[in-house]
């Protein structure tokens, strides 16, 4: 008995005088504007994106928009076309969606917040956008109290216009239209497609926040990974830095590249190699590899427990007014619009800790 | 360039044993999971057995469980499939496999014949 | 176990036919499926994995598509070197299972 290092858990409520605001991650669930996608663009992506079959031909479709179609043909007309060099990162940071035009309006603690205020940061959905990243030298942002007013409130436009059109099942095309949101501690980056929630247009969202601060053991008394981090790639360790950290090698080793949200220096995958290599093992690794990418617990970790509400936006009260405001049509405001509020809902942390059962 | 290369096989009386093995290269061993798929005279393809790449977990078809043992070395980089109380029935080709999003490559194929 | 039943399990063709080799999982196994090509006393050939992804270096005349239960392999256009024995596979859960094979002859 003496030998079983049995530990018990501590749970506490600790009030606090201010609050570290987390990091918030966003990301358009459409990955590139299609206005953005130039003649080059199609030529080397587009059968990645089910635009186009592998003879460079726009597929025979009877689901095409009739203004995307005429645009997409005109863009697919190969005739004495020279392609040009391509990048996916490049493809990516240009054609993603601009937090400038997203965000029609950003308020944090009741300031006025602008686009200035998120960082880029790249993801498996392409180009997203941090606020509060704590990084490039800017101070972590505190609350002083509880409740919607003291945390960050924004409004945005998912530009559904701007979506891709669907005419095949691809991992880089989707079928929903909003945001995919991630809270978490600037201490670890953002695995927004595993760890985010969505959030619809037409809604206001609110997420009430509770931080929670977990101690673990390390052996024999827990599990918990007690050294820093073995990585080229990440200063702290965290189960998410751990994660991107394998599944950059996974890919490296079976495609011999990196997706573009990966860290490292591993030469950006091809179009060409993303649809025939590095989707499908990532697609392997994520759901069906229990064992490659197995990281261990650290042994301080800060997570944020939510609570998630929402009302209608706009209600009929306010279409006329927004769809003034912003110069668009009822409907674009219905269909595209939407608000999100993050804030805690009481100034305390909560503390669950491992604890030695004895000495 | 990856290779899977299968050894072992040949004739064997019914209840006899054999060991198959079967040496990669080309890749990290100890990081993908491995199966062993059989294939009898003039029939289709069976999947036999199922490690991963640790060698912790183990995974066998019904037809086979409790008289085959699949493990793997990863110090030499080597699966193998320890076949005992072998039946007529399991007269075959036996192929190695790489697990993963894509099953390759597979070992050339090895001929086990159990008769007397 | 998950079941994969092959249809047909023999099919005549000629050469440019088009044609189709279905195959149906007992439950779902999203898109982890392959299709292989094997010919008298060969390995099998990956055709196409993860359902729709052609394997580099196999014609494109070969496609595969479905998610779930149900998937085709088709060959747009036969050639004599088609002439073989395909099997699906699906990787989704062990135990892995295979169809039971369907013979392309010549007509």
């Known amino acids: 008995y003496y030998f079983c290092y049995h530990h018990v858990t501590k749970l506490d409520e600790v009030a606090a005088s201010q609050l570290t605001f987390p990091a918030v991650t966003l990301c358009n669930l459409n990955e590139f504007r299609f206005s953005q996608v130039s003649k080059n663009d199609l030529y080397h992506a587009g059968e990645l994106l089910a635009l186009l079959n592998n003879r460079y031909e726009i597929p025979d479709t009877q689901m095409a928009d009739e203004k995307q179609l005429e645009i997409l043909q005109d863009k697919a007309n190969f005739r004495s076309f020279k392609p040009k060099p391509f990048n996916m990162r490049e493809f990516y940071d240009r054609a993603g969606h601009d937090i400038r035009d997203m965000l029609l309006s950003c308020h944090f603690r009741g300031e006025a917040c602008s686009a200035e205020d998120f960082k880029v940061v790249f993801t498996r959905y392409g180009k997203c956008y941090t606020f509060n990243s704590g990084q490039d030298g800017r101070p972590r942002l505190k609350t002083m109290k509880g409740g919607t007013g003291n945390g960050l409130e924004i409004m945005l436009d998912i530009q559904q216009d701007e979506y891709l059109p669907v005419w095949g099942e691809t991992d880089e095309t989707s079928f929903e239209a909003g945001i995919k949101v991630q809270i978490h501690s600037q201490d670890e980056p953002p695995f927004i497609d595993q760890l985010g929630f969505g959030v619809a247009p037409g809604f206001q969202t609110f997420v009430s926040c509770q931080e929670q601060r977990l101690i673990y053991l390390p052996s024999p008394w827990g599990t918990c990974n007690a050294v820093t981090m073995d990585s080229d790639f990440f200063d702290s360790y965290s189960i998410t830095a751990c994660r991107i950290d394998c599944e950059t090698r996974y890919l490296v080793e079976n495609c011999n590249c990196r997706m573009v949200h990966m860290p490292g220096d591993a030469p950006y995958c091809t179009p060409e190699q993303y649809k025939e290599c590095a989707d499908p093992a990532l697609d392997f690794l994520v759901e069906k590899d229990q064992e490659y990418c197995v990281c261990e617990m650290p042994c301080n970790l800060t997570r944020y427990g939510k609570e998630l509400s929402m009302v209608k936006i706009p209600s009929k009260a306010s279409a006329k007014y927004l769809a003034k405001k912003f110069n668009k049509s009822e409907q674009y405001i219905g269909e595209n619009i939407l608000v999100l509020d993050i804030f805690f809902e009481v100034l305390n942390y909560e503390t669950i800790e491992q604890k030695k059962a004895y000495e | 360039e990856v290779q899977l290369l299968a050894s072992g096989g040949g004739l064997v009386q019914p209840g006899g044993s054999l060991r198959l093995s079967c040496a990669a290269s080309?890749?990290?061993?100890?990081?993908?999971?491995m199966s062993w798929v059989r294939q009898a005279p003039g029939k289709g393809l069976e999947w036999v057995s199922g490690i991963s790449g640790s060698g912790g977990s183990t995974y066998y078809a019904d037809s086979v469980k409790g008289r085959f043992t699949i493990s793997r070395d990863n110090s030499k980089n080597t699966l193998y499939l320890q076949m005992n109380s072998l039946r007529a029935e399991d007269t075959a080709a036996y192929y190695c496999?790489?697990?993963?999003?894509?099953?390759?490559?597979w070992g050339q194929g090895i001929r086990v014949t159990v008769s007397s | 176990d998950i079941q994969m039943t092959q249809s047909p399990s023999t099919l005549s063709a000629s050469v440019g036919d088009r044609v189709s080799i279905t195959c149906r999982a007992s439950q779902s196994i999203s898109s982890w499926l392959a299709w292989y090509q094997q010919k008298p006393g060969k390995a099998p050939k990956l055709l196409i994995y993860?359902?729709?992804n052609l394997d580099s270096g196999v014609p494109s005349r070969f496609s595969g598509s479905g998610s779930g239960t149900d998937f085709t392999l088709t060959i747009s256009s036969l050639q004599p070197d088609d002439f073989a024995t395909y099997y699906c596979q699906q990787y989704n859960s062990y135990s892995y299972t295979f169809g039971q094979g369907t013979k392309l002859e010549i007509k």
């Open positions: 080309g890749f990290t061993f100890s990081s993908f999971a």
């Open positions: 496999a790489k697990e993963a999003y894509k099953w390759q490559p």
């Open positions: 993860k359902a729709s």
